[in-house]
Interface confidence: low
């Protein structure tokens, strides 16, 4: 048992022309977090099924708002390490998805949005306790650094995490720098010493003194690149040193087979062996499958098993995206009529109507004077989703059932009197005016 | 929105050839384009795909029978098809692989391709 650890140190856009922009923005800030998906990189069989070995979800990273007219930074990160727990042995190859997902922190109803921004995948050759092991992925125009490493839990000790050690009852029978080991009780094991220089990134060991390399390393202490390595190749000038041929500039230099892939040299250039999973000249576009569980959020997968086929996402109501990663705002589209309020629940759609209107979508107009009585004589008058009522003389109110105090208003002008009259009112206009309301 | 549109199908004779053509629009950073086929009651299957790169690669049954092109410039796929047999019956889907991270996935309408013996 153990536990393989993810930490990222950057993302954001890669080098050269065509970077992307911030994928948030002042208007939508937004916050990045990441998961990992790890599958046993040489068993044929769990290569069919889904983060076989575990996958992980990091915490939300800050939020983070564009500066307008500022370039694209690397972008602020989560929080801590992704933490894969591994039950069984350790397996040495491995292949991994990391995917960047974009949170839209938006006033958006139904909560935020997620998207993918990018995905990167590998093959990798990784023995349990050794150092950490550094990476650089670029997804597009994206650029994502990391690194990672396996190591055992207590008491399982070993490049596999097999072997299992427990404390003694007596440690100090041991010499210094001597850790306690089972199987026998009183045995001490010294901890496990590579050959003096074997490269701590691309070499390990399973026996003390020994080098053994990664993947696309070579030499006694695994520091020469394979593609690299003299004698290897008859192209070039001759070392004065080894009297081998060093190679010169050769198609497979640097490797440029992406993912793990192997390079071989054809007469016309070269030829990329790719990993499964994997496809492209130089295995740089990854074939992912249903398999792993790429449609989020019950999003029903469709496509052939086999790394070589694509895959589409059926989505479920609410969602969109080829990942079904994001969330449809329904609201947007402005379902509710007659300026009903609309509430996106997620699994349905709710319209919170205005006075006056009703129905699913608020589209139902109703009769604001239907069942309503204006008293005393007054109309009811429709309109705007609510009744109102035009009273009669004398009378006022919602209903017209509050007899009016014509007077109240002080309706005569320039100091004339008023007198309440069964007809209306009555002004006597002081000397010099005159008309109904002592206007003139 | 991206859309293909499959054409060339039909009945042939065992032993006969035809040649579908996928035209693809709508669509930025394009990955790969492919033809996949699903015989009836069978499932989908990929036959053949080639990468923007020109890379190719096909299905076992198919090698050496069929061949995949494509014509960058107007944005097709050709898929020639030689020695049918009637185990090549079927839907035939064009599907297009688009995006700066090579994971959204497009699929054709498919188009009938008829082998009798």
């Known amino acids: 048992a153990g536990v393989f650890e993810l930490q990222i140190h950057s993302f954001g856009p890669g080098p050269g022309p065509g970077a992307p922009r911030s994928p948030c923005s002042a208007r939508l800030p937004c916050r990045l977090f990441f998961r990992v998906c790890l599958k046993p990189g040489l068993s044929e069989e769990a290569a069919e099924s889904p983060c076989a070995l575990g996958a992980a979800l990091s915490a939300r990273g800050p939020v983070y708002t564009e500066q307008p007219g500022a370039p694209a930074p690397d972008l602020p990160l989560p929080d801590g390490l992704l933490q894969v727990p591994f039950r069984d042995a350790w397996p040495g190859t491995f292949s991994f998805i990391i995917e960047t997902w974009r949170e839209e922190l938006g006033d958006q109803i139904g909560g935020p949005a997620w998207s993918l921004l990018a995905r990167v995948a590998g093959r990798r050759r990784l023995a349990a306790g050794g150092p950490w092991a550094r990476d650089i992925q670029r997804a597009g125009a994206w650029e994502l650094r990391f690194s990672y490493r396996a190591r055992c839990e207590p008491p399982a000790v070993g490049t596999a995490c097999t072997r299992l050690c427990r404390p003694r009852s007596a440690p100090s029978r041991c010499g210094p720098g001597l850790r306690p080991c089972a199987p026998l009780e009183d045995e001490c094991e010294a901890p496990l010493v590579c050959r003096a220089g074997c490269s701590p990134e691309h070499g390990f060991c399973e026996q003390p003194g020994e080098c053994r390399c990664l993947e696309g390393w070579t030499g006694p202490l695994c520091t020469v690149p394979v593609s690299t390595s003299s004698c290897l190749s008859p192209r070039g000038p001759s070392s004065a040193t080894t009297g081998c041929l060093v190679p010169g500039p050769g198609p497979c230099d640097g490797n440029p087979c992406a993912n793990g892939g192997s390079c071989s040299e054809t007469p016309r250039s070269f030829e990329c062996t790719c990993p499964r999973g994997f496809y492209g000249l130089r295995c740089e576009v990854s074939g992912v499958t249903c398999a792993d569980g790429p449609c989020f959020n019950g999003g029903l997968c469709v496509g052939g098993a086999d790394p070589d086929s694509a895959y589409i996402c059926h989505c479920p109501p609410g969602f969109q995206g080829s990942n079904c990663e994001k969330r449809v705002d329904r609201c947007s589209l402005q379902p509710c009529r007659n300026g009903g309020l609309c509430l996106d629940l997620g699994h349905a759609l709710r319209c919170r109507c205005r006075a006056g209107f009703a129905g699913p979508r608020c589209e139902h107009d109703l009769d604001d004077c239907a069942g309503r009585a204006c008293a005393n004589g007054g109309t009811c008058v429709e309109g705007g989703g609510a009744h109102r009522c035009s009273c009669a003389l004398g009378f006022g109110g919602r209903d017209c059932r509050e007899r009016a105090d014509p007077c109240a208003a002080r309706p005569c002008a320039h100091g004339g009197r008023c007198y309440a009259h069964f007809s209306g009112l009555v002004c006597a206009c002081a000397p010099g005016y005159m008309g109904a309301r002592c206007e003139f | 929105q991206v859309q293909l549109v499959e054409s060339g199908g039909g009945s042939v004779q065992a032993g006969g050839s035809l040649r579908l053509s996928c035209a693809a629009s709508g669509y930025t950073d394009r990955c790969s384009m492919a033809w996949y086929r699903q015989a009836p009651g069978k499932e989908r299957e990929l036959v053949s795909r080639?990468?923007?790169?020109?890379?190719?690669n096909y299905a076992a049954s198919v090698k050496g029978r069929f061949t995949i092109s494509q014509d960058n410039a107007k944005n097709t796929v050709y898929l020639q098809m030689n020695s049918l047999n009637p185990g090549d019956t079927g839907m035939y889907y064009c599907?297009?692989?688009?995006?700066?991270?090579?994971?959204?996935?497009?699929w054709g309408n498919g188009i009938l391709v008829t082998v009798s013996s």
């Open positions: 599907a297009i692989i688009v995006g700066r991270t090579c994971s959204l996935n497009y």
């Open positions: 080639i990468s923007t790169s020109g890379f190719t």
